[in-house]
Interface confidence: medium
């Protein structure tokens, strides 16, 4: 039993952490393979997660995480029984991959605009609520040249869109990502897109 | 505006239990956390612990692990502290606050002054 | 655990005095991403809530007077008010939430 591409680490920086690999041949993750992980700290627990298959041979583990903090380290071990495949370390402060905003909607908006709001995924509690940015695609559904990316860099998780800044009468898709800057994070998933008519007439006949 | 409704006082005997509450007004309860403090006569603050009303997960002080359990009621926007075994080093005020972050406890309650006596 | 320690443990002043108080962490509490301090300042007044006054170590809450001022990093905060009024008579309390919340003692502020 080997593992082909070693485990890859990112915590969502308030209660879970994921780590992925890949084994040198299909594998039943559950059944065969233990990820043993315990906080770098005298006295900590030491915690197993039993892995899911993703693929026939790539383990996907979660492990839940509590209120990390940045100097938080976790000491990873992969067991196929009593034989250890791989060992190594992981810092979640290190590898932020932000959940993913959430609730996006669209309203109409006074001078021809649209307001796209959407909800911050984290608590005020915790560290990255007050450092997340947001990109948010928007486009045609009906024609793929026809789209348009925003950065939104100032903390409100919203986005005012001029509706002449699209075709009137076409129908647009959104969807927003996060990512957190002083972290170095990766991009979140993209949230679940929404959907609405373009159109140029007063907002009161709608 | 945001305000946390707390009764003003408790008077339980030694040994026994009690459940204090925290009504939430004025912002959507599942949008904060809430958090319990105590506070002795003369003594700083302590932080016991949180609650996050949406999923019910805990937190907690040590301390107070086996001493205080946090709930919620969402339809009834209260959030309760049953404290159990008390003794006279349980009498105290305790406060609820919410908003609790990495800012700062933005909104408090009035405080609970509990008094454990025969 | 992270302890937190206020000093003085009170203190007595006359009206228009500028005061400082100080606060000191067992461990910094700098976020050396964010670059912020996770503190915070609290007033609380006889037989009232306390209210927070400070966070992030400097950054003033919103309806606090400008002479409320909060500095320092790392382990060594500082609360000034630059012109006590009688109002501030209270105990002040810093607060750390780099890793859970801990409170210090506090201090007294007495308006002579």
């Known amino acids: 039993v080997k593992v082909l591409h070693e485990p890859s680490c990112f915590s969502d920086y308030i209660s879970t952490s994921v780590c992925q690999w890949k084994m040198d041949h299909p594998t039943n993750c559950s059944a065969e393979l233990r990820l043993s992980y315990q906080l770098d700290f005298m006295g900590s627990e030491n915690h197993t997660c039993v892995p899911e298959n993703r693929e026939d041979s790539v383990c996907v583990c979660s492990m839940p995480i509590d209120d990390a903090v940045e100097a938080d380290v976790y000491q990873l071990d992969l067991w196929a029984g009593q034989q250890l495949l791989w060992s190594g370390s992981f810092q979640p402060s290190k590898h932020v991959k932000p959940r993913t905003p959430g609730n996006l909607t669209v309203y109409p908006n006074i001078s021809h605009t649209w307001l796209l709001m959407w909800t911050n995924p984290y608590p005020t509690e915790n560290h990255l609520h007050s450092e997340l940015t947001y990109m948010v695609n928007v486009s045609n559904d009906n024609d793929p040249e026809d789209f348009k990316v925003y950065n939104v860099t100032y903390m409100g998780p919203t986005l005012r869109l001029a509706a002449s800044t699209l075709k009137s009468g076409a129908s647009y898709s959104a969807r927003v990502r996060a990512w957190a800057q002083t972290y170095n994070s990766t991009w979140s998933d993209w949230s679940p897109s929404t959907t609405w008519l373009n159109y140029y007439e007063p907002w009161e006949q709608h | 505006q945001v305000q946390l409704q707390q009764p003003g006082a408790e008077l339980v005997k030694p040994g026994a239990s009690v459940k204090l509450s925290c009504k939430a007004s004025g912002y959507t309860f599942t949008n904060y956390w809430i958090h319990w403090m105590k506070q002795r006569p003369g003594r700083g603050l302590e932080w016991i612990g949180r609650i996050d009303p949406n999923s019910g997960g805990t937190k907690y002080n040590e301390k107070f692990k086996s001493k205080a359990t946090l709930t919620v009621d969402k339809p009834s926007i209260t959030a309760y502290m049953q404290l159990s075994s008390l003794t006279s080093e349980d009498s105290a005020v305790y406060y609820c606050a919410a908003f609790g972050s990495t800012y700062g406890f933005a909104y408090w309650g009035q405080g609970t002054l509990v008094t454990v006596s025969a | 655990d992270i302890v937190m320690s206020q000093s003085p443990s009170s203190l007595a002043v006359s009206a228009g005095e500028k005061v400082t108080m100080s606060c000191k962490s067992s461990?910094?509490?700098?976020?050396?991403?964010?670059?912020?301090?996770?503190l915070a300042w609290y007033q609380q007044k006889p037989g009232q809530s306390p209210k927070l006054l400070i966070y992030w170590a400097s950054t003033r809450e919103s309806g606090v007077p400008d002479r409320f001022t909060g500095s320092g990093s790392g382990t060594d905060f500082t609360l000034t008010i630059s012109s006590v009024q009688a109002e501030d008579l209270a105990v002040y309390y810093c607060k750390q939430s780099y890793n859970l919340y801990t409170f210090g003692g506090g201090t007294k502020l007495e308006i002579k």
């Open positions: 461990q910094s509490l700098l976020n050396s991403r964010t670059r912020k301090n996770y």
